[in-house]
């Protein structure tokens, strides 16, 4: 069956996000992937969206992330826009109103996005074959 257009949009956004480092991609987020054995796919997407929302809500106006040059400022603003887009699309795929995020483990945002990209690419390869 055909892949959801939202899934393609998520992969495109993740590709853009993982191409660029910013001052704040090394900051840590909750690692929901560390122990996701008994988690449904929809719950994983919902929890990933929750983590991203927590990150951009907290760091959108963080002066350390905005940097000291126009280029750093621009890259951070772009990062936030892409995270918001990813959050929206993940909620769309999840179809859940809310989900708990209680893990203690942390990973950098950069690693979190790479892991999410791997999961999404695997999902895409299954639905496109």
């Amino acid at each position: 069956h055909k892949c959801d257009i939202t899934l393609q949009e998520i992969i495109k956004t993740l590709n853009s996000l993982t191409e660029q480092k910013t001052l704040c991609t090394e900051l840590t987020v909750t690692d929901i992937f560390a122990a996701s054995k008994n988690t449904t796919e929809k719950e994983t997407f919902c929890r990933a969206a929750t983590v991203l929302r927590q990150f951009y809500s907290h760091h959108e106006k963080d002066t350390r992330c905005l940097g000291a040059t126009a280029q750093q400022f621009h890259r951070h603003k772009q990062l936030i826009r892409f995270l918001k887009r990813l959050d929206r699309n993940l909620w769309g795929l999840a179809g859940l109103n809310s989900c708990p995020v209680k893990e203690a483990n942390q990973s950098t945002l950069e690693n979190f996005l790479e892991r999410l990209k791997t999961i999404m690419r695997e999902k895409y390869s299954k639905c496109s074959s």
Epitope: L66, A68, T69, A70, Q71, F73, H74, Q78
Partner: antibody, heavy 116, light 108 residues
């Protein structure tokens, strides 16, 4: 609601200077840039320069570098654009805009007429 | 400096028509492109950013596509309020911004 309110129209003599203000409401100054763009009568847009108040950086379009100064007063959330050595070709509507690469909110525009 | 060339410079169309405006960059700009609508005597209004993201509150009949050097703004079904001038703008060379020359959409 974000609003950018610019100062009123100006008529200036060639060789003089003009200073246009742009007062921002909302949280514009805390995490956005303010860019200045002008539009000559019946023409397209020219980006003149911009300022990022929260980090204090200012950048100018090369052709305006010698004549334009962009400043910001964080305490009043107001940005300023001063253009010196005015000539008739500077007659245009000058816009400020909240910017992060693209301009999502614009001021109403300030008409500057340069005439002897 | 990156130059943006819009085509056509003007077009005539009827209400209900599908309208396509193109913007070509002199070098690759990834997806760092925005589209604006301007009506006479008014400030421009942002329609699309990041080449394809619809600005909040903008009707879904507007869409943007493209990446690299070639970009398109499409109005799927032209409405009376859509007669205006449309501009593209690149921000890949941030902080330097450049605009296209504009496309005037007139009533046929």
């Amino acid at each position: 609601q974000v609003q950018l309110v610019q100062s009123g129209a100006e008529v200036k003599k060639p060789g003089s200077s003009v200073k246009v203000s742009c007062k921002a409401s909302g949280d514009t100054f805390s995490s956005y840039a303010i860019s200045w763009v002008r539009q000559a009568p019946g023409q397209g847009f020219e980006w003149m320069g911009g300022i990022i108040p929260v980090i204090g950086t200012v950048n100018y379009e090369e052709r305006f570098q010698d004549r334009v100064t962009i400043t910001a007063d964080n305490s009043t959330s107001t940005a300023y654009m001063e253009l010196t050595s005015l000539r008739s070709e500077d007659t245009a509507v000058y816009f400020c805009g909240r910017e992060e690469g693209f301009l999502d909110y614009w001021g109403q525009g300030t008409l500057v007429t340069v005439s002897s | 400096a990156i130059q943006l060339t819009q085509s056509p410079s003007s077009l005539s169309a009827s209400v209900g028509d599908r309208v396509t405006i193109t913007c070509r960059a002199s070098q690759g700009i990834s997806s760092a492109l925005a589209w604006y609508q301007q009506k006479p005597g008014k400030a421009p209004k942002l329609l699309i950013y990041d080449a394809s993201s619809l600005e909040s509150g903008v009707p879904s009949r507007f869409s943007g596509s493209g990446s690299g050097t070639d970009f398109t703004l499409t109005i799927s079904s032209l409405q009376p309020e859509d007669f205006a001038t449309y501009y593209c703008q690149q921000f890949n060379s941030y902080p330097l911004l450049t605009f296209g020359g504009g496309t005037k959409v007139e009533i046929k």
